[in-house]
């Protein structure tokens, strides 16, 4: 399977429900490159779920533009309602959810939560600090949000939805207030974990900008993209300093974007990938 | 002090099955704090890690991809003992296999090692 | 699987000199805890292996000051700071930050 086959579930940093994208380029944020045409294009608005439209420089950019609104929808949207409730909420549980709890070989008594299959719930256990298996987490609320389902046989998903009549998007009834980052840093600390396209399962992290931490993840050995650290130190050097956090009182602040060379993508935290 | 003492024949022929014995004194088989293995040594493939058990709340063991379909190591608390069990060998299975603790508390690594036992796959 | 590779294969050295074995590993050995997943063995000729440094920089009981470890990363060393003649042997990596736990492919150091 090709990258491009493949659905990615994500949670954005306006924390809205998580999403499944057709493609990974269409959670990127609509780049107008550097060059200085004036041309109309189309991108997919994550925080809209919409497409939308935008100008384009005429040079380089990113995947996530298309000549028509249409074949934007045709990328990036799913065109049935009932499609979009159905993939959004009903995911399937990553694979290592069914693992049993594993200490590892070592003796460290960390606390940790596993999604316990026989109970159905995420439990606390005793982690050794090395090895084990992937089925732990650091918080019994990232357990849960990735391993539990919610009352209906759903996953968790701790926003309320509603489906959008007007314009088939999906709508969070959450009333969190969404905290927003204004960055400095690096651009490419912003890009969602990209596995890339090769088969291989390294050790690497990812500056994930909606907790402001490096998550590690595994990288498939080629592509990908620059949010790629083979340590913690060096994604923490690159990325973390160039944050910092704006807590926004409205809802969703909508930033007028600056023409410049440094392309910034948006923010996700991808929770998991098929085949990882 | 701990001591790993193997046991098994040094023979073997091609299809049967593998089987050693690592007999422990000065720690126990079931202790929470150690872990225990089996690694060969050959020229053609130098150190290669086989599997190993620990005991927690429960038993636990992993194995090596390589040998997965092929390997069982079992413990037995009654003679303080864990075994190793390698069936369909082939010529390619022919090392040196050595038994070893895994120190789990202080110090992570394998700090107690058997003397080793040559098995050779041969008709 | 973490790949280890070592350099150099085979290191002559004179007594009473520094020696340096290089140890990479084709996947960073997570640093949690502070611990990097990383061991260091020797075996010497016709021996066991022993443990000689765990958790990347520290000496296992019994061995003498002189074996020092570091590194983070992909990239660790082990030194000797002055070899003597016991030292003789093959020296192995070893991580554990993933299974299969897997070793270098070992560097033989022997007395010029």
């Known amino acids: 399977d090709s990258e491009e086959d493949e659905e990615h579930t994500i949670i954005t940093d306006t924390e809205l429900p998580p999403l499944k994208l057709m493609h990974s380029f269409c959670a990127f944020k609509a780049d107008d490159g550097p060059c200085k045409a004036i041309m109309k294009r189309f991108f997919f608005n994550i925080f809209t779920r919409q497409c939308e439209e935008f100008i384009y420089g005429g040079c380089e950019g990113n995947q996530n533009r298309f000549e028509s609104l249409e074949e934007c929808k045709k990328m990036c949207t799913r065109d049935n309602a009932n499609r979009i409730i159905k993939t959004t909420l009903q995911q399937e549980k990553p694979d290592f959810c069914f693992l049993e709890e594993d200490p590892g070989i070592c003796r460290g008594y960390i606390t940790r939560y596993f999604y316990n299959n026989q109970t159905k719930q995420c439990e606390r256990f005793k982690y050794g600090g090395c090895l084990g298996n992937m089925n732990n987490f650091e918080t019994l609320e990232e357990c849960k949000n990735i391993c539990e389902d919610g009352p209906n046989g759903f996953q968790v998903d701790n926003y309320g939805t509603q489906l959008n009549a007007v314009n088939n998007s999906l709508t969070p009834q959450s009333t969190k207030v969404p905290s927003l980052f204004e960055f400095h840093g690096p651009s490419w600390c912003l890009t969602p974990a990209d596995r890339g396209l090769c088969r291989a399962n390294e050790n690497r992290f990812y500056y994930n900008s909606v907790i402001g931490k490096c998550r590690p993840f595994k990288y498939s050995g080629c592509g990908g993209n620059e949010n790629n650290f083979t340590s913690k130190q060096e994604c923490l050097r690159a990325c973390k300093k160039g944050f910092i956090q704006r807590i926004s009182k409205g809802g969703l602040i909508k930033t007028k974007r600056k023409r410049k060379k440094q392309r910034v993508k948006i923010a996700y935290e991808e929770i998991f990938v098929k085949n990882m | 002090q701990v001591q790993l003492q193997q046991s098994g024949p040094g023979l073997v022929k091609p299809s049967q099955t593998l089987s050693l014995t690592c007999a422990i004194s000065g720690d126990s088989v079931s202790s929470d704090s150690a872990a225990w293995s089996w690694i060969r040594q050959s020229p053609g493939r130098g150190l290669e890690w086989l599997g190993i058990i620990y005991k927690r709340s429960k038993w636990y063991n992993r194995y090596a991809v390589s040998v997965k379909s092929r390997i069982t190591i079992n413990p037995d608390t009654s003679k303080n003992q864990f075994s190793l069990q390698l069936n369909s060998v082939t010529p390619e299975d022919t090392a040196v296999y050595y038994c070893?603790?895994?120190?789990?508390?202080?110090?992570?690594?394998?700090?107690?090692w058997g003397q080793g036992t040559l098995v050779t796959v041969s008709s | 699987d973490i790949v280890m590779t070592q350099s150099p294969l085979s290191l002559p050295v004179t007594p009473g000199e520094p020696a340096s074995i290089s140890c990479r590993s084709s996947q960073s050995l997570v640093m949690s805890f502070g611990i990097t997943y990383l061991n260091w063995y020797l075996q010497k000729p016709g021996q066991s292996p022993q443990l000689l440094i765990y958790k990347g920089s520290n000496r296992a009981s019994g061995v003498p000051d002189r074996f020092s470890g570091s590194g983070s990363g992909t990239d660790f060393t082990l030194k000797i700071s002055r070899v003597e003649a016991e030292d003789v042997g093959v020296y192995y990596c070893?991580?554990?930050?993933?299974?299969?736990?897997?070793f270098g492919q070992g560097t033989k150091v022997e007395i010029k």
């Open positions: 070893a603790r895994w120190h789990s508390d202080k110090m992570w690594g394998f700090d107690d």
């Open positions: 070893q991580q554990y930050d993933s299974y299969p736990l897997t």
